[in-house]
């Protein structure tokens, strides 16, 4: 007699490695002969796909080497025409050893910036990675952490990290290593003691001492007003990764002497310098402290630099403190139109900042410093050599008037945020965000160099240095 | 390293007078606020007084007339003179490096105002 | 005078618990020219000076650890930590310095269960 088609082995999961055989097997029970078709995730099995064997009368799938795709769910649907078709489904799960599918590889890495060693893997279960650093497993700490993709990252890289590196990944059915790498710490350039100022007496002998360190050891050149020196004698000495310069003067006349470490990193380099001033004897003049008022910025030249409604400082040593302040920066403004790119931005942002200072709320109305991390950034990163020929065009002279110079900060006379984060002003056109981290370059005292910030856009940009309180 | 190193304090009767000191190292003086705060016994902490990088000093109304906050830039020393002093202004009283916050802190040198 | 009020006087926490203090400022302490708010936080262990945690109502403190957090604005904030260790226990202070007299909270002594 016919008979409706009756499942009587229903499909089960299957685990399967890869590269083995999976079978499914769904007996039914008819008659007549009921046609057996299969499908996985709803798409049919064709019966000339090779990857397929399909065998006692369509009751038996086999899946000759199982890839890592063929994960999902198989059903078998039997009809033969009596009673309605009948379907059975089951889940194939794929099991695959640990396999590392992007290894790490050998990087060399700037000190302070973050690194991240890729360790991709695949496999089923998900293998667990860990990372061996020399011979022992690798511990993390606030600064190293393993992502959940496997990679290795290493925020502010320190000297200490350098070494030789694997991943493993591991999980039930076997462990995978990779291949041992390296990881190099490269550090940038770094005064460790910047020479001192003096003031002498017409004629006397003055040793400017200068010590830098880095990775690897940078050479030290002194610079005499801009120009390379001339007269005196260096004498330099190296001793674990310390360069020290001692370079020994006859002084006649006044002078801007200037160290410079530089080492090299690809082909990129790497500057630290620090100034020390040789002045003669009742030469200075010391400059009078002046006050001022807050009010808004109506200018013209810093409205884009500026935050929108800021209050800033206006200095009441002008008799129209605003049109002086002004002209200030529309002067210096013009000088930046032929600086690099690079250097434009971040001039513009000095200038206007220093100039026109943020107000500090309160009784009085107190002006805020920039920081001097900001403005070494922009002495010695962003526009290292326009610093340089302004230097050397000041000292021989050729500048007119003095007006410029009121518009240029000394940077090792501003507060440091590293001290206190309250006493200065950033300005947040120079921070980075936090895909693109980069660090300052050192500070020209024996402080640590410090890491740009990455501040909400909601702190005010509005910061600088009227001529009252003129760091020049 | 920054370092505050406060002294001066001492035992003294009330109406008396005493002018306390705070030596810092480790950074350029000159260019930050500096701050006196104290706390009595037991209690919470006071602000006094804060001198800005030329010298123009604020004060709580406790103090005013009676404390006199000043500096030394070139002996990297910040000063505060107390006088006419009572019983109440027994504390230990902090020198205190910052702008709008107080960053860093020295160790304190205690004041007792008692016959 | 801006006056601080803050609250609770005392609270008590197991390690890994979230703690929060308030702190109300009697005149808001945020100064619109850079929108900044001059409200600061200090913890002070017992027989140690205290230590600034958070300035400008939320700027963590170079070296503190994230596990502490400071938000709010105008006149109402909170210090929040985020999982209690034993080395918190102290007494945690706010402070205005919108203007001066530059004035604190009374003190929240925050103690181990």
């Known amino acids: 007699l016919p008979k409706a088609p009756v499942i009587t082995t229903p499909l089960e999961t299957v685990d399967a490695l890869v590269e083995e055989v999976a079978t499914f097997m769904c007996a039914v029970e008819s008659y007549p002969q009921p046609e057996i078709s299969w499908t996985r995730n709803k798409i049919l099995i064709k019966l000339f796909d090779t990857r397929y064997s399909i065998r006692e009368n369509g009751q038996l799938l086999t899946i000759l080497s199982v890839e890592d795709s063929d994960d999902g769910i198989y059903c078998c649907t039997a009809n033969n025409g009596v009673g309605g078709a009948v379907e059975s489904c089951g889940a194939l799960q794929v099991k695959m050893k640990p396999k590392i599918t992007r290894p790490p590889i050998n990087v060399k890495i700037i000190e302070g910036l973050k690194a991240v060693l890729p360790c991709t893997t695949m496999g089923n279960p998900k293998p667990s990675v860990s990372w061996i650093k020399g011979d022992s497993p690798l511990r993390e700490n606030s600064r190293t952490a393993v992502l959940e993709s496997g990679s290795l990252r290493i925020h502010n890289v320190q000297k200490e990290d350098a070494g030789q590196y694997r991943c493993v990944a591991k999980n039930s059915l076997g462990t995978a290593y990779s291949k041992v790498v390296k990881l190099e710490v490269e550090v940038f350039a770094r005064i460790l003691r910047a020479p001192e100022s003096h003031n002498v007496t017409f004629g006397s002998f003055v040793t400017l001492h200068c010590t830098a360190t880095g990775i690897p050891v940078p050479t030290i050149t002194w610079i005499e007003n801009g120009n390379a020196v001339s007269s005196g004698s260096i004498q330099e000495s190296v001793k674990d990764r310390v360069i020290d310069s001692r370079l020994q003067l006859f002084i006649t006349k006044p002078g801007l002497y200037t160290c410079i470490a530089t080492n090299k990193h690809g082909e990129k380099f790497s500057t630290a310098k620090a100034a020390a001033t040789v002045s003669i004897a009742e030469w200075s003049k010391p400059q009078k402290d002046n006050k001022g008022y807050c009010a808004q910025y109506r200018g013209e030249v810093c409205n884009a630099v500026l935050a929108k409604d800021a209050l800033v400082f206006l200095n009441t040593s002008y008799a129209d403190p605003e049109e002086a302040q002004e002209l200030l920066v529309h002067t210096a403004w013009n000088e930046l139109k032929v600086v690099s790119p690079l250097c434009r931005p971040a001039a513009e942002a000095l200038l206007c900042n220093h100039v026109f200072q943020e107000c500090s709320p309160g009784v009085v109305p107190t002006p805020i410093p920039i920081c001097r991390e900001y403005c070494l950034a922009v002495k010695e990163l962003f526009c290292a050599k326009e610093w340089l020929a302004m230097e050397e065009k000041t000292h021989r002279g050729l500048y007119r008037s003095e007006m410029h110079l009121l518009s240029v900060p000394e940077c090792s006379k501003l507060p440091s945020m590293h001290w206190d984060p309250t006493a200065c002003a950033r300005l947040p056109h120079l921070d980075y965000n936090k895909e693109n981290p980069k660090t300052f370059p050192p500070m020209t005292s024996s402080k640590p160099s410090v890491d740009i910030p990455n501040l909400p856009s909601s702190s005010s940009s509005s910061f600088s240095v009227s001529p009252t309180y003129s760091m020049t | 390293e920054v370092q505050l190193v406060e002294s001066g304090g001492g035992l003294v009767q009330p109406g008396g007078s005493l002018s306390l000191s705070c030596v810092a190292s480790?950074?350029?003086?000159?260019?930050?606020?500096m701050n006196w705060v104290r706390q009595a016994p037991g209690k919470g902490l006071e602000w006094l007084s804060v001198?800005?990088?030329?010298?123009?000093?604020y004060y709580a109304d406790s103090v005013k007339g009676r404390f006199t906050i000043s500096r030394d830039n070139v002996k990297n020393t910040l000063y505060l003179q107390l006088n006419n002093l009572k019983p109440e202004d027994t504390a230990l009283y902090y020198c205190?490096?910052?702008?709008?916050?107080?960053?860093?802190w020295g160790q304190g040198t205690q004041v007792t105002v008692s016959s | 005078d801006i006056v601080m009020t803050q609250s609770p006087s005392s609270v008590t926490a197991s390690a890994g618990e979230r703690v929060t203090i308030n702190c109300r400022s009697s005149?808001?302490?945020?100064?619109?020219?850079?929108?900044?708010?001059?409200l600061n936080w200090y913890q002070q262990r017992l027989g140690q000076s205290p230590r600034l945690l958070i300035y400008?109502?939320?700027a963590r403190e170079s070296g503190v650890p994230d596990r502490f957090s400071g938000s709010g604005s105008t006149t109402n904030f909170t210090l929040t930590i985020s999982s209690f260790q034993p080395e918190d226990a102290a007494v945690y202070y706010c402070q205005q310095s919108y203007k001066p007299p530059y004035g604190f909270g009374s003190g929240t002594r925050l103690e181990i269960k």
């Open positions: 005149q808001s302490v945020l100064y619109s020219s850079n929108q900044k708010n001059y």
């Open positions: 001198i800005d990088t030329h010298s123009i000093a």
């Open positions: 480790g950074f350029t003086f000159s260019l930050y606020y």
């Open positions: 400008w109502a939320s």
């Open positions: 205190v490096l910052g702008r709008t916050a107080l960053v860093r």
